[in-house]
């Protein structure tokens, strides 16, 4: 039958927490990023504001996999599902703040918003 | 090591039928959508069919339409290919791909394939 | 149906740079993915994203995409780069591969 629509959930949830366990030096060279609204559209928005960060291993898994959650393709400097830009976070804080909220969608059966 | 390792190939005659099995290993099955691509001999590759992780959609193209059937069982970690009216020109190697993670897993980009079993359809 | 049209061969002397073309309708669009493929072996993901390169994929390879055309780069092209290129992007529902290049490194 139809895969449970968490599963996919689980493994960027997984990435996000081995991202904010293996932080020795800061994240991405402290790089900041718009912060986000964590409402409809957040895979989209989360994609389109860690998309400008580049040369940063660190995070690329996690790009990639949110890719898969966007219908649409997001590029550098794109900004359609970011409505509000007026707030800049560290990368580090991005994740966790990222983390906390993909763990209540996966605790009450979401996936996608 | 994410492994992916196909059986179920050989000869079969025009209008024949052959079921493919992938057997998947190293990775969560569950959460990746698999994929079937075909490579006839001396020619470039042609994806066949997508099987997601997430809602359990299935896609074709056009030349297998109506007579393969992808299937997968993940209490098996094993991705399936029922290919009937088999005709001339469906040999080819036919490999198992893991795809991307998601509802728009085609995003993602198919990171890792297998070696291949190879379908022959003569008579 | 949608069609990714791409040189039959291109050749490069060693340590040379090799450009690969992709063409399709809007292909800018959408994400392309670049593969691989030698002699008897199983295609290799090179490229994702359309500029992405998954680990252990050398930096000599790179790729691009804007408009109607996606381009894969291979800077100071070696002997084991001789292969099979395929692009490929997602269009209504379909994985679509590219016609395929040989690239040829001489000498």
């Known amino acids: 039958g139809p895969v449970p629509p968490s599963t996919a959930l689980r493994e960027l949830i997984e990435e996000l927490v081995n991202i904010t366990q293996n932080q020795k030096a800061p994240l991405c060279n402290g790089s900041m990023v718009w912060s986000i609204n964590l409402t409809a559209g957040m895979y989209c928005a989360a994609l389109e504001s860690l998309i400008n960060v580049s040369g940063c291993s660190a995070i690329e898994k996690t790009q990639r996999m949110l890719s898969g959650f966007c219908p649409h393709k997001v590029s550098a400097g794109q900004f359609s599902s970011l409505h509000v830009r007026d707030t800049k976070i560290e990368v580090a804080h991005f994740i966790t703040k990222l983390l906390s909220y993909t763990k209540q969608l996966f605790r009450h059966g979401q996936q996608f918003n | 090591e994410v492994q992916l390792l196909e059986s179920g190939g050989g000869l079969v005659q025009p209008g024949g039928s052959l079921r493919l099995s992938c057997a998947a290993s190293g990775f969560t099955f569950s959460s990746y959508a698999m994929s079937w691509v075909r490579q006839a001999p001396g020619k470039g590759l042609e994806w066949v069919s997508a099987?997601?992780?997430?809602?359990?959609?299935?896609y074709y193209a056009d030349s297998v339409k109506g007579r393969f059937t992808i299937s997968r069982d993940n209490s098996k970690n094993t991705l399936y290919l029922q290919m009937n009216s088999l005709r001339a020109e469906d040999t080819a190697v036919y490999y198992c791909v893991q795809d991307g993670l998601g509802p728009y897993f085609y995003n993602y980009g198919m990171d890792v394939w297998g070696q291949g079993t190879t379908v022959t359809v003569s008579s | 149906s949608y069609e990714l049209t791409q040189p039959p061969s291109v050749s490069v002397s060693p340590g040379q740079t090799a450009s690969i073309t992709c063409s399709g309708d809007k292909l800018g669009d959408k994400y392309t993915c670049w593969f691989q493929q030698k002699p008897g072996q199983s295609p290799v993901l090179v490229i994702y994203?359309?500029?992405k390169r998954p680990s252990g994929i050398p930096e000599r390879f790179s790729g691009s995409n804007s408009g109607d055309t996606a381009t894969l780069t291979i800077s100071g092209t070696q002997a084991m780069d001789e292969a099979d290129y395929y692009c490929?992007?997602?269009?209504?529902?379909?994985?679509?591969f590219g016609t395929g290049t040989k690239v040829t490194v001489l000498g």
């Open positions: 490929q992007a997602w269009d209504s529902s379909t994985y679509v």
């Open positions: 994203h359309d500029s």
């Open positions: 099987f997601s992780g997430s809602g359990g959609s299935t």
